[in-house]
């Protein structure tokens, strides 16, 4: 069967943006008008993991692209990259853990702890245009929680 | 060798609550998770809810307001409570270990435990 | 939830029959469908799982095949010690879900 995925933008609890930052890394900023445009649109699908009554396996591809999000340690810590695949096989139902993210509603919000990684989160920082990143905390500065918008 | 072991009070009060552990070895609690599972005498089988290595639980919706799974990785143990039962929560309960094979064979459940029958009866 | 029609119910054969008991999907589950034997008294054994793999240790007159809603279980020569009763159970997603059972029974 088909993996179920739907197509959304993301924005953090500062109402900051996704854009591609060169080819494999994205951004967090404030955008109006026709640059809303620049956001990125993600294909989130629903896949096997560690489900939860609060926690919804996901995984978060970039629409018509063959690049997912992924969790990886490099230098010794929990990193948040963009991975190339073959289109051939993904999406699919059964993704490699690094590529799934639980994704947890709390009061309309939503966070996306990382599967290979508890406790690390899709994060962004308080600042402009930096990069989307891996964090270990939740409620400190770095923001965590996300709004979803589904487009058509 | 994977062993599970269910224990608890055969015999349980309608309103009281039903309390199970599951003693695991051979495995450990941090890397696999595990179902509870129960059986009517004379009846099919019947998925109650389960914990994951993480700690993470999923509970079936029709006992999901009853329902308590928790653990202590420590002492290889996974407790299941029931509270409010009735005569129809009268089964024999099993616990078994998730398969955990990412990206291959996740939810399927490998090793059980003998099970235990707890009738509920005043 | 996906509901898991079993059948027969029960089922009487012979000592070197060939057997074979089906289970349906209420939706596509691919091939995540698990196969368990249970014997009065006893906790249910996982014979097969994703479908058509034989657990280790597991005789080869076991089998199971299909994938999407329709599965099929089959015993190719039975023997007196695999009078049981059998279920079916999707491993697709939860709530983990089994069908109704067959209890295979001496003719």
């Known amino acids: 069967a088909p993996v179920r995925s739907l197509h959304c933008t993301l924005r953090d609890a500062q109402l900051k943006s996704l854009v591609m930052s060169g080819p494999y890394e994205l951004k967090a900023l404030h955008l109006q008008g026709q640059d809303l445009e620049q956001q990125v649109v993600f294909s989130m699908s629903f896949v096997q993991g560690e489900e939860s009554n609060d926690k919804i396996p996901v995984a978060l591809g970039l629409k018509a692209k063959n690049l997912y999000l992924s969790c990886v340690l490099k230098d010794d810590k929990p990193t948040l990259q963009l991975e190339s695949v073959d289109p051939k096989n993904y999406p699919k139902k059964k993704m490699e853990k690094r590529f799934v993210f639980n994704k947890i509603e709390i009061n309309n919000k939503l966070e996306f702890e990382s599967a290979q990684f508890p406790n690390w989160y899709i994060s962004t920082s308080q600042a402009e245009s930096m990069p989307v990143f891996l964090g270990g905390t939740r409620g400190g500065q770095d923001i965590t929680d996300f709004t979803m918008q589904f487009v058509s | 060798e994977v062993q599970l072991q269910e224990s608890g009070p055969g015999l349980v009060k309608p309103s009281e609550t039903l309390s199970l552990t599951c003693t695991v070895s051979?495995?450990?609690?941090?890397?696999?998770?595990v179902s509870w599972i129960r059986q009517p005498p004379g009846k099919g089988l019947e998925w109650i809810g389960l914990?994951?290595?993480?700690?993470?639980?999923y509970y079936n919706s029709p006992l999901k307001s009853r329902l308590t799974i928790s653990k202590d990785n420590s002492k290889s143990q996974v407790s299941l409570k029931l509270s409010s039962v009735t005569a129809a929560d009268t089964a024999v309960y099993y616990c078994?270990?998730?398969?955990?094979?990412?990206?291959?064979?996740?939810?399927?459940?490998?090793?059980w435990g003998q099970g235990t029958l707890v009738t509920v009866s005043s | 939830d996906i509901q898991m029609t079993q059948s027969p119910s029960s089922l009487s054969a012979s000592v070197g029959d060939r057997v074979t008991i089906t289970c349906q999907a209420s939706?596509?589950?691919?091939?995540?469908l698990n196969w368990y034997q249970q014997k009065p008294g006893k906790a249910p054994k996982l014979l097969i799982s994703?479908?058509?793999t034989l657990r280790p240790g597991v005789p080869s007159r076991f089998s199971g095949s299909g994938s999407g809603t329709d599965f099929t279980f089959t015993i190719s020569s039975l023997q007196p010690e695999d009078f049981a009763t059998y279920y079916c159970?999707?491993?697709?997603?939860?709530?983990?879900?089994f069908g109704q059972g067959t209890k295979l029974e001496i003719k």
């Open positions: 078994a270990r998730q398969t955990n094979l990412w990206a291959y064979d996740l939810y399927s459940m490998d090793y």
């Open positions: 051979g495995f450990s609690l941090s890397d696999y998770g």
């Open positions: 914990i994951w290595g993480g700690g993470d639980t």
């Open positions: 939706t596509d589950i691919d091939d995540d």
């Open positions: 994703l479908g058509s």
């Open positions: 159970l999707q491993s697709d997603r939860l709530p983990l879900t």
